[in-house]
């Protein structure tokens, strides 16, 4: 559409420019005035003037292409005809003058002959001579005037020739422009066809989108009914759960009573037995070494603190003892969170969650840890990246990531930019881009500008996971637009 408009405009501009040049050449001729002084008589000839004001208000008259010459040329021809008429009138007037003189002379001669006396012959001869002289003088004057007129006519002919040359030039320009206009019209019609084709395509696409929407609505209503059923089941489960909790509470009370009884009897036997210390674990490796070798959620304690955190421990993969610090698997948890939330952690340790930057920072600054990132795509493939040394700086340094020694199957180059970057969230912009990567790509991550990875991006389901700039990305395995199906980030002491 815009191309068409552009061509139409340029076409008008070309014509307007040509027209203005033509007007300038006409203006340079201007109004010429010739004055001839002869005796007591003065003859003034006004040559025709080019009148620019009367041209059409439109810069280009639509039918001008079909004309033999521009409008100004017609004016010139008309003015020349007027001049020729004037000259013809002059000639007739001169002839009348001659006739009048001749008639007068004849009359005077007859009178002289009738009234003359012999002795007046000399006077009469003198008068005759004077009249002849006067006639000769008049004839000379007429000859001069004729010469002047001839002169002007020659000049006009020259100007006319010049005009016809410039007219030819203009005609050629107009013809060129006409062919240019035809070309542009062809181009326009081609573009119009293209636009129409695109419109048709667009209508088809809209139709398919509408169909998809209808299908989705059906799906949504199905899901709603499923959700309703699940809610009912949850209510039942909750009731059952509360019953179980009560039973568990009763059991615990019984166990505690038994323990109290046992400890009472034991202390009676041996008063030196100390109260058993509460065991706390810093990470899943310690949990594993204490004999708990099943996967699940365990309570970990911050180093040098009583503060606790719940984490999922993978006790099977690669020898076990892995503390899961991030998991994505189904899009059930929103990862577009605040700095505070990424600091303390969020989500559900048994499903999608982020363990918490503060805990990971404190943990990884106590001893050397390895980081393993396990990835799954939508085609059933799996890959991993293993960093032999990983730690996070403190919050004061924006939890900057530090990584060394990459191995694994998810790309030979690290998809987490090296050297490590500061952590950024939607409300804590610490990246190297003038944009705000976390706001643009969603999720908190160690963005560069914005970098080749973001495992906390938007979760896209299958068949919607390609060409996504803000998805779950690990560039050196799947490229920039591919959003992964599942990711797990896990840490373990290097000396495990």
């Amino acid at each position: 559409m815009w191309q068409i408009v552009f061509f139409t405009l340029s076409c008008d501009l070309v014509l307007a420019a040509a027209y203005n040049n033509f007007r300038k050449s006409m203006d340079s001729i201007g109004k010429k005035q010739y004055q001839v002084q002869h005796g007591s008589c003065s003859y003034t000839f006004l040559l025709p003037e080019m009148d620019n004001c009367r041209s059409s208000s439109s810069p280009y008259v639509s039918n001008a292409v079909q004309r033999d010459a521009p409008l100004e040329y017609d004016d010139s021809v008309q003015r020349l005809q007027v001049l020729e008429n004037i000259m013809e009138n002059n000639t007739q007037w001169l002839m009348k003058l001659e006739n009048y003189i001749q008639d007068n002379m004849k009359k005077e001669m007859v009178e002289i002959q009738q009234n003359a006396v012999q002795n007046q012959t000399a006077v009469m001869i003198e008068i005759g001579t004077n009249l002849l002289n006067q006639t000769a003088e008049q004839t000379r004057k007429l000859t001069d005037v004729e010469a002047q007129v001839l002169n002007q006519t020659t000049r006009l002919e020259l100007q006319l020739l010049e005009h016809s040359l410039s007219t030819n030039k203009l005609e050629k320009q107009i013809l060129d422009q006409t062919s240019e206009i035809n070309k542009l019209q062809d181009k326009n019609s081609f573009l119009e066809k293209k636009v129409l084709a695109m419109e048709d395509k667009h209508i088809i696409q809209l139709q398919s989108i509408k169909e998809e929407k209808d299908q989705l609505q059906v799906l949504v209503s199905k899901q709603n009914s499923i959700i309703e059923e699940l809610e009912k089941k949850i209510v039942t489960a909750t009731v059952n759960n509360s019953v179980l909790q009560k039973q568990q509470h009763d059991l615990m009370e019984t166990v505690n009573n038994l323990l109290t009884m046992m400890s009472t009897s034991n202390s009676a036997k041996d008063p030196t037995v100390a109260k058993e210390e509460q065991i706390s674990f810093r990470d899943c490796a310690e949990v594993f070494k204490s004999g708990h070798t099943t996967n699940g959620i365990y309570t970990l304690t911050f180093p040098n603190s009583t503060e606790e955190i719940k984490a999922y421990c993978d006790m099977e993969a690669g020898g076990g003892g892995w503390t899961i610090i991030q998991r994505r698997e189904d899009g059930s948890v929103d990862f577009q969170r605040t700095w505070k939330e990424y600091k303390v952690g969020f989500g559900n340790p048994s499903g999608e969650y982020w363990l918490g930057n503060e805990f990971v920072s404190q943990l990884t600054n106590q001893q050397r840890y390895v980081l393993k990132i396990h990835l799954k795509d939508w085609e059933g493939n799996e890959a991993y990246s293993l960093y032999e040394h990983f730690y996070l700086s403190s919050e004061e340094l924006n939890y900057r990531i530090h990584l060394k020694g990459l191995t694994g199957t998810a790309g030979k180059i690290s998809s987490i930019s090296q050297p490590g970057n500061d952590f950024s969230t939607k409300d804590g912009d610490n990246d190297k881009c003038i944009c705000k990567c976390s706001q643009m790509l969603t999720g908190g991550w160690w963005f560069d500008a914005c970098g080749p990875s973001n495992l906390n991006g938007m979760y896209y389901p299958q068949r919607q996971n390609t060409n996504k700039f803000n998805g779950i990305k690990w560039y050196y395995w799947k490229g920039s637009g591919y959003s992964l199906k599942a990711t797990t980030m896990m840490i373990r002491p290097a000396d495990f």
Epitope: K340, E358, E395, D427, K436
Partner: antibody
Framework: QVQLQQSGAELVRPGTSVKMSCKAA????????IGWVKQRPGHGLEWIGD????????NCNEKFKGKATLTADTSSSTAYMQLSSLTSEDSAIYYC?????????????WGQGTLVTVSA | ENVLTQSPAIMTASLGQKVTMTCSAS???????LHWYQQKSGASPKPLIH???NLASGVPARFSGSGSGTSYSLTISSVEAEDDATYYC?????????FGGGTKLEIK
């Protein structure tokens, strides 16, 4: 220094809405969260929600969802809170407050408060 | 939500006396996100202590804070007349932020 200037007291009819403002000065408006706190006599302080003007993000106390709408105009460095379907329960002093995104210092700065009285 | 319970609700102290008020959380709170505010009659609340034990600017050294997990406290080593106010604890362990009901300190 940091200043949070709140709009004047409002006397409103039940069922209507009220929109109060909090004009910030002395800091970069888009870098800090603006929170809103309600105080009723004998009820202590209640957090309504907060907004991050740098992206228009909001967090809201479930209790005030449907009641409070938080907005911010970065061009005038002003945060707004609109309360709808007012009842006598909404008669209170409403404070705006500022906090760093890390929130290490809590609500570091407070406005002078806007008194809203809902009465027929 | 994490409910904060302050005790006592009202306390009376003599000038120069040491007073301690407590704030108990229904679930664990990170010490980074436990703060105290002072509100004098007819005024807006003002920050007193942030991150459990750090004094806000301009706060006298007679104020101190401590605690971890679910139990936190605020202590005034030697009460002065200007300390007549209501003191609120506030936490963030995930949304929503919550405040305690307040402890009103009256000076004899």
């Amino acid at each position: 220094q940091v200043q949070l200037q709140q709009s004047g007291a409002e006397l409103v009819r039940p069922g209507t809405s009220v929109k109060m403002s909090c004009k910030a000065a002395g800091y970069t408006f888009t870098d800090y969260w603006i929170g809103w706190v309600k105080q009723r006599p004998g009820h202590g302080l209640e957090w309504i929600g907060d907004i991050y003007p740098g992206g228009g993000y909001t967090n809201c106390n479930e209790k005030f969802k449907g009641k409070a709408t938080l907005t911010a105009d970065t061009s005038s460095s002003t945060a707004y809170m609109q309360l709808s379907s007012l009842t006598s329960e909404d008669s209170a002093i409403y404070y705006c407050s500022r906090s760093d995104y890390r929130n290490d210092e809590g609500f570091a700065d407070w406005g002078q408060g806007t008194l809203v009285t809902v009465s027929a | 939500e994490n409910v904060l319970t302050q005790s006592p609700a009202i306390m009376t102290a003599s000038l120069g006396q040491k007073v301690t008020m407590t704030c108990s959380a229904s679930s664990s709170v990170s010490s980074s996100y436990l703060h105290w505010y002072q509100q004098k009659s007819g005024a807006s609340p003002k920050p007193l202590i942030h991150r459990t034990s750090n004094l806000a600017s301009g706060v006298p050294a007679r104020f101190s804070g401590s605690g971890s997990g679910t139990s936190y406290s605020l202590t005034i080593s030697s009460v002065e007349a200007e300390d007549d106010a209501t003191y609120y604890c506030q936490q963030w362990s995930g949304y929503p932020y919550t405040f305690g009901g307040g402890t009103k300190l009256e000076i004899k």
